[in-house]
Amino acid sequence: QRLPRMQEDSPLGGGSSGEDDPLGEEDLPSEEDSPREEDPPGEEDLPGEEDLPGEEDLPEVKPKSEEEGSLKLEDLPTVEAPGDPQEPQNNAHRDKEGDDQSHWRYGGDPPWPRVSPACAGRFQSPVDIRPQLAAFCPALRPLELLGFQLPPLPELRLRNNGHSVQLTLPPGLEMALGPGREYRALQLHLHWGAAGRPGSEHTVEGHRFPAEIHVVHLSTAFARVDEALGRPGGLAVLAAFLEEGPEENSAYEQLLSRLEEIAEEGSETQVPGLDISALLPSDFSRYFQYEGSLTTPPCAQGVIWTVFNQTVMLSAKQLHTLSDTLWGPGDSRLQLNFRATQPLNGRVIEASFPAGVDSSPRAAEPVQLNSCLAAGD
């Protein structure tokens, strides 16, 4: 399926799982992009923000003395509450341990900026992508993924951290956004809605998709997540929209079939390694890119977001399993775990393809509203 008003030949899908290529062009700041900390009640019941370590849980942050230079690829780091000892953290949701910064939730108190001041920053994520306003940037080359086809053993940790379902990735998954822009994958997690209600974090021309996958990466310039937080390009997230299609997605089924085992908040299981790239669209050449933030506290900025133009297709049953199996804090279903879109505040979203123009043969050099900043500069 295509996004609203998307050019006909820009399938936001057609990827590894028969997706449609729905993203067109990028997103300029707009009035309706006025800053919001969380989803105003009423905007599709949008929850607040995402669960990265702040993007879900980033890999554990280890004290420097322990495993210096090595990274535990588990939960993304959560923000340390003022005065908290710098202890290694296993996951972002630590209510029972009294870490103030784990006391956040979607669509409610406390306001996220109180949890982490960065959540009130000017360059936050997610955003609404407007293909017509995206800057076509030919310098954005196809993404390169290496080592994403994991063998079944060793097994991987799949965890319900109360904010999302997160798969911790082993060392060795390398991703390049371009020459000299190299990253290592840490974890992936999903965002979803509820019955009949979409739950992607990013939107395209205001259209929200059923769900969204995020694969979180750490720049090879940093040994630890806590060193990279807030640094431009320190973290990079690959994001893809999940849509309903006619067939079961066998790659996703390897994870979705295990959700019942981790229905309870804080529970985890082990799953066989799988081809992580099969969870993403097949077209690595067409995407949108912008600099934003983690979508959950600590909301650290400087995160490079790459949003695939192609979507991934899951069956209706699979999307239902995703949105209706897990439980979060306070005996409530884990649903609508997405943050409201944030204002661009002057940011220009770049596109690796001419997303805002009919790309049929008759179109010569498309005229773009925004010009591209050379990637990697």
């Epitope: 079944p152 053993l153 066998s250 799953v271």
Partner: antibody, heavy 124, light 107 residues
Framework: QVQLVQSGGGLVQPGRSLRLSCTAS????????MHWVRQAPGKGLEWVGF??????????QYSASVKGRFTISRDDSKTIAYLQMNSLKTEDTAVYYC???????????????WGQGTLVTVSS | DIQMTQSPSSLSASVGDRVTINCHVS??????LSWYQQKPGEAPKLLIY???NLHTGVPSRFSGSGSGTGFTLTIRSLQPEDYATYYC?????????FGQGTKLEIK
């Protein structure tokens, strides 16, 4: 040499319980996941389940056909793996094999060492 | 669950023949497939792992090939001791599943 020796089979009535044992020798038992595979008379092989090693938390995994009725456990100090079968049904009648498969150095589950098998007959 | 379909279900062959047994898998399992040999009254024995790797002690006349959803076990020159039932097994994800077996008989 590397071997798995099984015991505990026999005739049992439907609804009753039985425990199979599998004693390992000749290899570092703690490194491995231990599986159970069964074969109904004249039929093919069916995976029953496995138990992970200590490094992976000793957690078990079961096939849908036995989940909730069978329990796999292990005693590393005795190098024994167990299959506790409760609420047995006539369709559980089979030769049960204890199998070694999967450890820190392997990259998927293949079954390289098999016990001699023990027949479990569920009949009234 | 991943379905495994072997073909043929049975075949007759003579000593010295070249024999191939196929295993079709319902979804992509990369190379995470093993082959086993079982003789009557005995436990199965591992022949091939990771689609094409020969297990220790297995004669070199046995070989395996394939990846994704199609796999083949080949016996280059059939010997009398090779008459048995052969099973393929996927080790990509649980529940681990086996093919229904191929019975190799003397012609």
């Amino acid at each position: 040499q590397v071997q798995l020796v099984q015991s505990g089979g026999g005739l049992v009535q439907p609804g009753r319980s039985l425990r199979l044992s599998c004693t390992a020798s000749g290899f570092t038992f703690t490194d491995y996941y231990m599986h159970w595979v069964r074969q109904a008379p004249g039929k093919g092989l069916e995976w029953v389940g496995f138990i992970r090693n200590k490094a992976s938390g000793y957690t078990p995994q079961y096939s849908a056909s036995v989940k909730g009725r069978f329990t796999i456990s292990r005693d590393d100090s005795k190098t024994i793996a167990y299959l506790q079968m409760n609420s047995l049904k006539t369709e559980d009648t089979a030769v049960y094999y204890c199998v070694r498969g999967g450890h820190a150095g392997s990259n998927y589950w293949y079954f390289d060492v098999w016990g001699q098998g023990t027949l479990v007959t569920v009949s009234s | 669950d991943i379905q495994m379909t072997q073909s043929p279900s049975s075949l007759s062959a003579s000593v010295g023949d070249r024999v191939t047994i196929n295993c079709h898998v319902s979804q992509n399992i990369n190379v995470w497939l093993s082959w086993y040999q079982q003789k009557p009254g005995e436990a199965p024995k591992l022949l091939i792992y990771q689609a094409s790797n020969l297990h220790t002690g297995v004669p070199s006349r046995f070989s395996g090939s394939g990846s994704g959803t199609g796999f083949t076990l080949t016996i280059r020159s059939l010997q009398p001791e090779d008459y048995a039932t052969y099973y393929c097994q996927q080790g990509q994800s649980y529940p681990f599943t086996f093919g229904q077996g191929t019975k190799l008989e003397i012609k």
